[in-house]
């Protein structure tokens, strides 16, 4: 008996052959002998199957002694043997219907478990093998589980289903909802602009939900809400922001943040939570600021910075075209008499600048320039 | 959106080897019978070659044993395999999906023109 | 195989009048014929499938009769986007054939 395996909603054709090559009478009946379909001279007929609407042949084939079952639209229930009568013959055919569904949305929030459930006829003993789209192999039976979905797992999950020695094929295309970024940091002197940018790492046609950042900076004790909003069909509208600082909000995706000036007292690390509409859980995204201020108080030249700085950054002050006079694994620096010229306040990270603010020191009989 | 797109065409000698592609999106190609459909300058349209849903291969006496017709599920891609061209197989070449119950064409794609010259 | 002949070759005609193709098989095949619609540098167009069924989309003045060996194409009230060539094909039987085509002009 030959088998053929099926798609749940796909089409299949089953295959019937006459020794001639002419039209002749066939009927497919299945395994309880209802008739499914034949032909009267060049007219298909159809039988009180259940798959009536479902079911046809192909006119086209049948003078080359081609009668072929084809059931469209296939469901688990489908799964039977099919027996085609021609020419004093019966063809048989066990056809095997096999469904591969996520367990929920296939739109999944990262850090979340993905599970997909294979759909299977009885008696039917089949194994499934899913590849991701970063490459990873999953073994399983009726239910494989893959936890802590990670953005690299967005994409086509290809599955293959195994019975009898035949095997069937499943796309199923995933997307883990997160952002570009798990972490960033920006780096501003005192008194610039600071531009936070959170871009999604996936799109969708509509877009709906709330988020909020709330920011620790590092001079409180405690992290308040900066900035709330609302996200309908892509389109941002401010809810609630603080009088200080008072941050301004793109009303277009990516969420853009723009905070009018970088202090001491806004230093620190933020987390921007968003949780979208039907979904269980929030997206999150952290982000840090440092801040640098260079100052000269009589003879003392001072640079600092203010913010999450990792313990191997290097803060130096040097004057222009020279060597470092002071460079400290340190939050702080400063050269006492410092002599004229312009110095530089430099942040760096393995010789990559990542910070840089001048200061312009004048003659001792005047006030220091800040460029 | 339903769409069918043929690449492959071109220039190519008598005895000479050519491969068609025919890409689709918007439905899922093994669901379908699919064929190759021709038409030559100036010249009606001609029946080339089909796969059907099974994947059971039928060709037009024209082309039988040059031809070879093929399909990839997983990339949703028909192809047309034309071996010993003759200047007769030049034409322009359109994939179209057959209906789900008749051997009529219901989506055609733009067409790749194959032209066989010395 | 199943010879199809369509007539006539082409014909000239204004916008509004009523336009009739013929294609006659050679060979009884039943109501299994379809209609196709071309225009320069395109694909064809599906018009009309087992002799009378219109395609979704098709306009209403597009009608198709006829079985067994003779079928009919009619356009009751040609419109401009109607100039075009016009091929029958049977469905019938494998090797598929299709008429060599009407082409519409401009009176």
């Known amino acids: 008996k030959k088998v053929v395996l099926g798609k749940k909603g796909d089409t299949v054709e089953l295959t019937c052959t006459a020794s001639q090559k002419k039209s002749i009478q066939f009927h497919w009946k299945n395994s309880n002998q209802i008739k499914i379909l034949g032909n009267q001279g060049s007219f298909l007929t159809k039988g009180p199957s259940k798959l009536n609407d479902r079911a046809d042949s192909r006119r086209s084939l049948w003078d080359q002694g081609n009668f072929p079952l084809i059931i469209k639209n296939l469901k688990i229930e489908d799964s039977d043997t099919y027996i085609c009568e021609v020419e004093d013959q019966k063809e048989e055919v066990q056809l095997l219907v096999f469904g591969l569904t996520a367990n929920s949305d296939t739109h999944l929030l990262q850090g979340q478990s993905l599970t997909l459930t294979l759909e299977s006829p009885p008696g039917s003993s089949p194994s499934v093998q899913c590849r991701s789209p970063r490459g990873k192999n999953i073994q399983g039976g009726k239910t494989l589980s893959v936890s802590q979905l990670e953005l690299q797992d967005s994409g086509t999950w290809t599955c293959t289903v195994l019975q009898n020695q035949k095997k069937v094929e499943f796309k199923i295309d995933i997307v883990v909802l997160a952002f570009q970024k798990a972490s960033s940091i920006v780096y501003k002197k005192e008194g610039e602009q600071v531009e936070f940018s959170f871009p999604l790492a996936f799109t969708v046609e509509k877009l709906t939900g709330s988020g909020e950042l709330w920011w620790q900076a590092e001079r409180a004790s405690s992290s308040k809400s900066w900035i709330t909003f609302d996200l309908k069909n892509k389109e941002v509208s401010v809810k609630r922001v603080t009088q200080d600082p008072k941050l301004q909000m793109g009303k277009k995706l990516p969420l853009h943040l723009t905070l009018p000036q970088a202090l001491p007292q806004y230093a620190g690390s933020g987390n921007l939570t968003l949780a979208l509409e039907a979904k269980t859980g929030k997206l999150h995204q952290e982000v840090n600021l440092v801040v640098m201020r260079a100052t000269q108080l009589q003879k003392n030249l001072t640079c600092e910075v203010w913010g999450p700085t990792s313990p191997k950054l290097m803060l130096s002050l040097k004057l222009e075209n020279k060597e470092a006079k002071v460079s400290k694994r340190e939050k702080a620096v400063w050269v006492l008499n410092p002599e004229a010229g312009m110095w530089q306040c430099l942040l760096s990270d393995s010789g990559q600048v990542l910070l840089e603010s001048n200061i312009k020191v004048l003659p001792t009989w005047s006030t220091p320039v800040q460029p | 959106e339903v769409q069918l797109v043929e690449s492959g065409g071109g220039l190519v000698k008598p005895g000479g080897s050519l491969r068609l592609s025919c890409a689709a999106s918007?439905?899922?190609?093994?669901?379908?019978?699919t064929s190759w459909v021709r038409q030559a300058p100036g010249k009606g349209l001609e029946w080339v070659s089909a796969i059907g849903a099974g994947g059971g291969t039928y060709y037009a006496d024209s082309v039988k044993g040059r031809f070879t017709i093929s399909r990839d599920d997983s990339k949703n891609t028909l192809y047309l395999q034309m071996n010993s061209l003759k200047t007769e197989d030049t034409a322009v070449y359109y994939c179209?999906?057959?209906?789900?119950?008749?051997?009529?064409?219901?989506?055609w794609g733009q067409g790749t023109m194959v032209t066989v010259s010395s | 195989d199943i010879q199809m002949t369509q007539s006539p070759s082409s014909l000239s005609a204004s916008v509004g009048d009523r336009v009739t193709i013929t294609c006659q098989a050679s060979?009884?095949?039943?109501?299994?014929l379809a209609w196709y619609q071309q225009k320069p540098g395109k694909a064809p167009k599906l018009l009309i499938y087992r002799a009378s069924t219109l395609e979704s989309g098709v306009p209403s003045r597009f009608s198709g009769s006829g079985s067994g060996t003779d079928f009919t194409l009619t356009i009751s009230s040609l419109q401009p986007e109607d100039f075009a060539t016009y091929y029958c094909q049977q469905s019938y039987s494998i090797p598929l054939t299709f008429g060599g085509g009407t082409k519409v002009e401009i009176k």
């Open positions: 179209a999906r057959e209906g789900w119950n008749d051997d009529v064409f219901d989506i």
């Open positions: 060979q009884d095949i039943s109501t299994w």
């Open positions: 918007g439905f899922t190609f093994s669901n379908h019978y």
